[in-house]
């Protein structure tokens, strides 16, 4: 649910961590309606989730955490 | 309703481990995370580390990484936590508790009733 | 992490605050979540999304946020309510994501 590069709305799907290979962070005061995660997946898809979501800040520590021990 | 059994009470050695189980029951195993908190007497509440089964992915707090290995088996709906090289100061109630993961509110709904761990020579 | 007052009292009827102090990668920036843990029980959610009762919680306790800090209201007290009531947010950059403030315990007087 992108547009123009900016998230439009989030996914209702739950996506699993092994498929995702990094995020990009969309602040609604930077240009954007709304705060967003967004996903970038192995597919070289762009998914956009609600980065208020339980499932998705755990995704997002995980990563951060990866890329802190690298 | 969903509950989360936990197992009972356990007496350890300083430098042993021990391992404690969660089991879910009345509920599918998807789309919640399993966290453990603990409780030192006392003493206010602590996480230690959680899964996401269907991630099959666990996080552990800072001060427990290395020391403990948190596992998830679908099959029978339970969570594991071991912890390992215990100390004095490990001497806690060790509880249970639920997360839905696709809400935005980050609480603990469910709870279980806790398992004690005592620590001594 | 989240600072609370160790203590706070009241008598039955009257309204007691308990205050939760945090900083902006947790309270700032995600949601507030209220335990009550009666004696020699595991804890009970109270209050979460910052001012949100699951079902079954009595109205008389309410739940804001403003800010870095967060509070608690119990309306009404009674000799029930005499508890260790814990808040709890998730944290975006600590060590471990769920961080909890030590407790104040509710005297009934």
């Known amino acids: 649910a992108s547009n123009f590069d900016c998230c439009l709305g989030y996914t209702d799907r739950i996506l699993h961590p092994k498929f995702i290979v990094g995020f990009t962070r969309q602040l609604a005061n930077e240009g954007c309606d709304i705060n967003a995660i967004i996903f970038h997946t192995k597919k070289k898809l762009s998914v956009c989730a609600n980065p208020k979501q339980t499932w998705v800040k755990y995704i997002v520590r995980l990563l951060s955490k990866k890329v802190k021990n690298m | 309703e969903v509950q989360l059994v936990q197992s009972g009470a356990e007496v350890r050695k300083p430098g042993s481990s021990v391992k404690v189980s969660c089991k879910a029951s009345g509920d599918t195993f998807n789309n919640f995370a399993i966290s453990w908190v603990r409780q030192a007497p006392g003493h206010g509440l602590e996480w230690v580390g959680g899964i996401i089964p269907v991630f099959n992915t666990a996080d552990y707090a800072q001060n427990f990484t290395g020391r403990v290995t948190i596992s998830a088996d679908k099959a029978t709906k339970t969570v594991y936590m071991e912890l390992r090289s215990l100390r004095y100061d490990d001497t806690a109630v060790y509880f249970c508790?639920?997360?839905?993961?696709?809400?935005?509110?980050?609480?603990?709904?469910?709870w279980g009733r806790g398992t004690t761990v005592t620590v001594s020579s | 992490v989240l600072t609370q007052p160790p203590s706070a009292s009241g008598t039955p009827g009257q309204r007691v605050t308990i205050s939760c102090s945090g900083s902006?990668?947790?309270?700032?920036?995600?949601?507030v979540v209220w335990y009550q843990q009666l004696p020699g029980a595991a804890p009970k959610l109270l209050i979460y999304s910052n001012d949100q009762r699951p079902s079954g919680v009595p109205d008389r306790f309410s739940g804001s946020r403003s800010g870095t800090s967060a509070s608690l209201a119990i309306s009404g007290l009674q000799s029930e309510d005499e508890a260790d009531y814990y808040c709890a947010a998730w944290d975006d950059s600590r060590d471990g994501p769920w961080v909890f403030g030590g407790g104040t315990k509710v005297t009934v007087l």
């Open positions: 508790a639920r997360t839905k993961i696709e809400l935005d509110n980050d609480a603990f709904d469910i």
């Open positions: 902006t990668s947790n309270i700032g920036s995600n949601a």
